[in-house]
């Protein structure tokens, strides 16, 4: 009877096992019955990173030069092209799709350290009493507004992202 | 599209002064933190002055501080650094830059020339 499982590096298909092509190569046609899979290496500038019965390769990443990307790693048919700033710049995530000089800190975070040349900003998270409400590379936390200085009482308190709110001291008639 | 277009430099005598523009457009200026940073001839990128939105808070580095003053009009979509008492050490091309910083957003830069 027909299977319904496949050992590992191959796929069912019209009830039966075929093998995956391996990594850097495409499918062109299924396995019968009497012939194996065929599988066709990728193209240049082309890429299969698993076994796979793809019947396309990828296109390798285009570091674009435009954005402040150079390869740091040149493809092959079983990898995709690495991308990496140029010097001094950072990339703006894990897949380095584009550079920044340097990051800002997002709300409710300020700057430890102001990026330099060798080094990106640093930020860290506000602490209690201090907020930011914006994304920057220079501004630190700032204090939550002291309401009592202004004889002002608290209305509404304050968080990481927000400063507190003050307002009129509820006077006894 | 973002465009940054900075003018103003030149050859200017020690102890000098010069006014830097930055004409912004393809985006909403106040909104954004702006920078002036600077590149000396062989040397990396180093950052001079920041200013926030609203023109309230600003950074300068040490190397500058008494000397430039970085201001904004968001009425005309602009940014300034007003640099006195230059020194040598100031010779650079000098940009202007929007937050986040993406490379593909900064302008060709003024270059400014201290020399006697």
């Known amino acids: 009877e027909p299977p319904t499982a496949c050992r590992e590096k191959q796929y069912l298909i019209n009830s039966q096992c075929c093998s995956l092509c391996q990594p850097g190569q495409k499918l062109v046609s299924d396995c019968t019955e009497f012939t194996e899979t065929e599988c066709l290496p990728c193209g240049e500038s082309e890429f299969l990173d698993t076994w796979n019965r793809e019947t396309h390769c990828h296109q390798h990443k285009y570091c674009d030069p435009n954005l402040g990307l150079r390869v740091q790693q040149k493809g092959t048919s079983e990898t995709d092209t690495i991308c990496t700033c140029e010097e001094g710049w950072h990339c703006t995530s894990e897949a380095c799709e584009s550079c920044v000089l340097h990051r800002s800190c997002s709300p409710g975070f300020g700057v430890k350290q102001i990026a330099t040349g060798v080094s990106d900003t640093i930020c860290e998270p506000c602490p209690v009493g201090f907020f930011s409400n914006v994304s920057s590379a220079f501004e630190k936390c700032h204090p939550w507004t002291s309401c009592e200085t202004k004889d002002l009482v608290v209305q509404q308190a304050g968080t990481n992202k927000t400063d507190v709110v003050c307002g009129p001291q509820d006077r006894l008639r | 599209e973002v465009q940054l277009l900075e003018s103003g430099g030149g050859l200017v005598q020690p102890g000098g002064s010069l006014r830097l523009s930055c004409a912004a457009s393809?985006?909403?200026?106040?909104?954004?933190e702006m920078w002036w940073v600077r590149q000396a001839p062989g040397k990396g990128l180093e950052r001079v002055s920041?200013?926030?939105?609203?023109?309230?808070?600003?950074y300068y580095a040490d190397s500058v501080k008494g000397r430039f003053t970085i201001s904004r009009d968001n009425s005309k979509n602009t940014l300034y650094l007003q640099m006195n008492s230059l020194r040598a050490e100031d010779t650079a091309v000098y940009y202007c830059?929007?937050?986040?910083?993406?490379?593909?957003?900064w302008g060709q830069g003024t270059l400014v020339t201290v020399s006697s």
């Open positions: 393809g985006f909403t200026f106040r909104d954004y």
């Open positions: 830059a929007k937050l986040p910083f993406y490379f593909s957003e």
């Open positions: 920041a200013i926030n939105p609203q023109g309230t808070r600003t």
